[in-house]
Interface confidence: low
């Protein structure tokens, strides 16, 4: 005769308020012959929670039918959970006795607790932005989960971080938790594509995390380099003078051509591109009048990116009735 | 990276009891349930129970209910299995090991076990 | 409590041979709310602590190789090790987590031939 036992896989279940719970038990042998009851708790002070063949029971039902002569399902479901519901759910075999019934098994238990989902996590970057090389700091909230266990990750472009800081309030008992966690990303060059996720994995989630994304282009500034160079070729009196403003971001970008020290007004002719790594190219044209009797003509190209410091390069125009090789030199 | 890291071996006599240690790190402690398996020389595996070291609630093997005592101090992501009244019988490496799963899901709450300890060596002589 | 029964007790295979374990248990481990089977397998080597292999009965833990396979369903599982390589050596054991206690079989000792 195979021995009895009684199978209550679930250690914890979490329910939410107003739902409904499913506590699983069953047995494995018909024998001995008795009832099964359910109790929550142990001891003398247990409470009955479901006994099939006397008391009412309005919120309690069975999902197996209990008169069949072959069941061995006798878990049942509980309606319309509420916080008092909670703690710890067993199902207990008696054995037929007199002149009363002996208990002859209890089940291992299942813990009810009730479970909220965490909010989708919320990630925030820094105030201002930072150039490469530099670390920068994202934060990542997410609030209103039970219970209080909860694991939370970071990643940069698919490849998980660990440099950050965690923590979970409040430390005691509550009926809602939130996290926050602050992770530390030291920027490349080529981030303005890149995005930090943060994920969120709770029991509520039934292994389907939550994530909260930011991208690294709102925190990133990639200075430009500048270059200046003459075109060989001269139109006339005109000498054709490009200012090569190259992998910068964001676009926000101011320039301006001096000649001789004394700022151009006039317009100039430029073109923007897009770089597949998302930074930027600005190339700017300017025309300059000269004759063959002029002084030469220092030129410079300024620009001002994204609210710093503005950089220029300075270009020597040598012009001669053979006109020479120009050379070039840069200031901060 | 994840470990369990234990303490080290322990002489005993019959009678004393015995406390281990088991110190988890590279994860979120209180996530995980942790278990203690035993296994006595050139023999097989003995699961003796768990531990959530959130709640701090335990579920023992009826063979050793009464004999043996799980707790946990979060504040070193440390996990204790106190066994007492040891007898000859009792000398085994013992083991601890965390449940494959970060949660319990609606459907199931026991699982296989993904990292283990080194082992402890507890040798039970007069 | 549910009991795990390994067999053989010992098994000698050439290498690159397969090699096949199997685990009874006496009552089933699909569980039919979810329809799985609660069973893992663990690889043992001389003074290292088990390894786990196989959880749900044929699902690869990750970063163990493709050779090691498992399947099976109700009472009856097996491990399979289809071309046996030399760090293989070792005692294998199936374990039951439908129902506390938890159960091991008593293991299996894979030797090369």
């Known amino acids: 005769e195979e021995e009895l036992q009684m199978i209550q896989p679930e250690k914890l279940l979490l329910v939410t308020v107003g739902k409904t719970a499913t506590l699983h038990c069953t047995v494995t042998s018909l024998l001995p012959v008795g009832p099964v009851l359910w109790f929550r708790g142990v001891g003398p002070g247990r409470e009955l929670i479901y006994n099939q063949k006397e008391g009412h029971f309005p919120r309690v039902t069975t999902v197996s039918d209990l008169t069949k002569r072959n069941n061995m399902d006798f878990s049942i479901r509980i309606s319309s959970i509420t916080p008092a519901d909670v703690g710890t759910y067993y199902c207990v075999k008696f054995r037929k006795g007199s002149p009363e019934n002996v208990e002859f098994k209890s089940g291992p238990g299942t813990e009810m607790a009730l479970g909220a989902k965490p909010s989708a996590p919320v990630v925030l970057g820094p105030a201002a932005r930072t150039t490469p090389e530099h670390t920068v700091s994202f934060t990542c909230e997410s609030h209103g989960f039970s219970p209080r266990d909860i694991t939370l990750k970071w990643f940069k472009n698919g490849n998980e971080l660990s440099d950050f800081q965690t923590n979970v309030d409040p430390t005691g008992q509550s009926v809602a938790y939130s996290i926050r966690s602050t992770a530390r990303v030291v920027l490349d060059p080529w981030d303005v594509r890149s995005q930090v996720i943060c994920e969120v994995a709770h029991v509520t989630l039934q292994g389907d995390p939550l994530r909260g994304t930011a991208n690294l282009s709102e925190a990133i500034r990639v200075p430009p380099t500048l270059e200046v160079t003459q075109q060989p070729m001269r139109v006339g009196n005109q000498v054709n003078v490009t200012c090569q403003v190259r992998k910068f971001y964001p676009q926000s970008l101011q320039l301006t051509w001096s000649e001789n020290g004394n700022v151009c007004q006039r317009e100039t002719a430029s073109t923007l591109t897009e770089n597949k790594d998302g930074t930027y190219n600005w190339t700017s044209w300017f025309l300059v009048n000269i004759s063959d009797q002029r002084d030469d003509v220092v030129l410079t190209c300024q620009v001002k990116h994204d609210g710093q410091l503005a950089v220029s390069k300075r270009l020597a125009l040598e012009v001669t009735v053979h006109q020479k090789d120009q050379s070039s030199d840069a200031t901060p | 990276q994840v470990q369990l890291v234990q303490s080290g071996a322990e002489v005993k006599k019959p009678g004393a009891s015995v406390k281990v240690s088991c110190k988890a790190s590279g994860y979120t402690f209180t996530s995980y349930d942790i278990n203690w398996v035993r296994q006595a020389p050139g023999q097989g595996l003995e699961w003796m129970g768990w531990m959530n070291p959130n709640s701090g609630n335990t579920g023992y093997a009826q063979k050793f209910q009464g004999r043996v005592t799980m707790t946990r101090d979060t504040s070193t992501s440390t996990v204790y299995m106190e066994l007492s009244s040891l007898r000859s019988e009792d000398t085994a490496v013992y083991y601890c090991a965390r449940e494959s799963y970060a949660y319990c899901s609606s459907t199931s709450c026991y699982d296989a076990f993904d990292i283990w300890g080194q082992g402890t060596m507890v040798t039970v002589s007069s | 409590d549910i009991v795990m029964t390994q067999s053989p007790d010992s098994l000698a295979v050439s290498l690159g041979e397969r090699a096949t374990i199997n685990c009874k248990s006496s009552?089933?481990?699909?569980?039919?709310?979810?329809?799985?089977?609660?069973l893992a397998w663990y690889q043992q080597k001389p003074g290292q602590p088990p390894k786990l292999l196989i959880y749900?009965?044929?699902i690869r833990e990750s970063g163990v190789p493709d050779r090691f396979s498992g399947s099976g369903s109700g009472t009856d599982f097996t491990l399979t090790i289809s071309s046996l390589q030399a760090e293989d050596v070792a005692v294998y054991y199936c374990?039951?987590?439908?129902?506390?206690?938890?159960?091991f079989g008593q293991g299996t000792k894979v030797e090369i031939k």
């Open positions: 374990q039951q987590y439908l129902s506390p206690p938890l159960t």
């Open positions: 009552q089933s481990l699909l569980y039919s709310s979810n329809n799985k089977n609660y």
């Open positions: 749900w009965a044929s």
